[in-house]
Interface confidence: medium
């Protein structure tokens, strides 16, 4: 996270960390873990842990570790021979399903996932929240949680920052409408590392609630504009995925 | 798993330049960070810096700001070190090394590459 | 720069006895609560091997008789009981600012 401070697990709960690749995820209830397809893709055992604001090993030794019994990448997901080479981040979104259940409590629980009313689309200026391990100004990785507010700005507004490290032609990069572009303000970002954390929006039905509006997905550059993967355009997919892979006893 | 499988030995006359190369295997590096060091015969270890894969972002030790450029290629996901000016204060073995899962530290190290600056 | 200082340049040390090892930053390396001090055994013709990292974490497969401690600027290394195998060069490096620096590296013969 560029231009952020240090963050309490209590106060993002659901924050999930993979180890690797180091990235995020969001805890969306007892068995489901909600990431990025990005980090996945590469990884379908990976090791996440809840429950720690520090990833400090020593540290993680003590926090919960889950364990996955599968990975669910979404089938709009195009897989590719050479990933490094990416610039079509479309339905950057995967599920995993968790061999036992989380226990909850109050540094671990999950965040709620957009509804389908029109009061869940977003706006520009809309606020969200994003944590994570990844790359800050000071270190290529946090030990501790970090986490910055940022508001929605227009998808034009991630398509004008010049892209880093291209790939390809700047032309090549896709934009879709599947994602939210966010960012901007006094260089708050989310970077390196922080892949698959919620951008997490205050429920506008209940005020003590957020849901995963955004996924960290990718972004031109650290510390300008970054795109998430807009989840409300895929509720269905992980109310689906997630019934048809439970056990009855969820039911 | 995580390999760090580096370039064979280099005999160099003083003045030329070398290209060391770090090749992964087990992980991307995109995903992590290649650093690299030198340790000259018989001396200790010195960083020569960083490089960030992913947007080639580097961070070089002062000392070798004028001597060093790294570079990566993600696509053969390998990161380069290349020496300039070479004189034979230059002659050592290079390694390259990379964090892993750790956020400081270097658990995985390529095996070496000895450059011997010679006339 | 941080200057790692570390004592003794080199020890010898009886089979079974402990050996200690010390190194000391020109200034404090700890960030965030945590001490960015790591610890490395280099053996002839091999690459460093990690030992300890954050000051005291033993990493994954090294024997326990390895203990490393300290905050700040001291930190010191401790073999007991020392092993035939342990004869080696053992080196600290901070990465709590750039550039990253080691130590000088102590020798450690069995006797």
């Known amino acids: 996270i560029i231009g952020g401070s240090d963050a309490d697990i209590k106060n993002f709960p659901w924050q999930v960390f993979f180890d690797n690749p180091w990235a995020g995820g969001a805890l969306i209830n007892e068995y489901w873990v909600l990431t990025a397809a990005h980090v996945v893709e590469g990884n379908r055992e990976p090791t996440m842990y809840v429950g720690s604001t520090s990833v400090q090993t020593s540290r993680l030794a003590k926090s919960k570790m889950l364990t996955p019994e599968h990975v669910f990448i979404h089938p709009g997901w195009k897989l590719l021979e050479v990933p490094e080479g990416r610039t079509n981040f479309d339905n950057d979104i995967a599920l995993v399903r968790l061999k036992d259940p989380v226990k909850m409590g109050p540094t671990v629980s999950p965040i709620c996932l957009p509804g389908t009313s029109s009061d869940y689309n977003l706006m520009d200026g809309d606020l969200g929240l994003i944590s994570g391990w990844g790359r800050t100004e000071k270190r290529d990785r946090a030990v501790r949680l970090k986490a910055a507010r940022l508001p929605v700005a227009p998808l034009r507004k991630c398509k004008e920052v010049k892209v880093e490290k291209p790939t390809a032609d700047a032309e090549a990069y896709v934009f879709t409408p599947n994602m939210i572009c966010a960012g901007g303000e006094k260089g708050m970002d989310s970077c390196k590392g922080d892949s698959g954390g919620a951008f997490a929006v205050q429920d506008p039905n209940d005020k003590t609630k957020f849901y995963a509006a955004g996924l960290v997905s990718w972004g031109p550059q650290c510390g300008t504009y970054g795109l998430y993967t807009r989840v409300k355009n895929y509720v269905d997919w992980i109310m689906k995925t997630m019934q048809e892979n439970s056990t009855p006893r969820e039911d | 798993q995580v390999q760090l499988q580096q370039s064979g030995a280099e005999l160099v006359r003083p003045g030329a330049s070398v290209k060391l190369s770090c090749t992964a295997s087990?992980?991307?590096?995109?995903?992590?960070?290649i650093h690299w060091v030198k340790q000259r015969p018989e001396q200790g270890l010195e960083w020569i810096g960083r490089i960030d894969p992913a947007d080639d972002h580097t961070k070089y030790a002062p000392k070798f700001q004028d001597k060093a450029t790294m570079t990566a290629d993600t696509s053969s996901n390998t990161a380069c070190l290349q020496l300039n000016s070479l004189t034979s204060e230059d002659t050592a073995v290079y390694y390259c090394?990379?964090?892993?899962?750790?956020?400081?530290?270097?658990?995985?190290w390529g095996q070496g590459t000895l450059v011997s600056v010679s006339a | 720069d941080i200057v790692m200082t570390q004592s003794p340049d080199y020890l010898a040390v009886s089979l079974g006895q402990r050996a200690p090892i010390s190194c000391k930053a020109s200034?404090?390396?700890?960030?965030?609560?945590?001490?960015?001090m790591n610890w490395y055994q280099q053996k002839p013709g091999q690459p460093p091997k990690l030992l300890i990292y954050?000051?005291?974490n033993l990493e994954f497969g090294i024997p326990t008789r390895f203990s490393g401690s300290g905050f700040g600027t001291d930190f010191p290394l401790n073999i007991h009981p020392v092993e035939e195998e342990d004869a080696a060069t053992y080196y600290c490096q901070q990465s709590n600012e750039d550039p990253w620096t080691f130590g000088g590296g102590p020798k450690l013969e069995i006797k």
């Open positions: 087990g992980f991307n590096i995109k995903d992590d960070y």
């Open positions: 954050a000051a005291s």
């Open positions: 090394a990379i964090y892993g899962s750790g956020w400081a530290w270097f658990p995985y």
């Open positions: 200034q404090s390396v700890d960030y965030d609560g945590d001490s960015y």
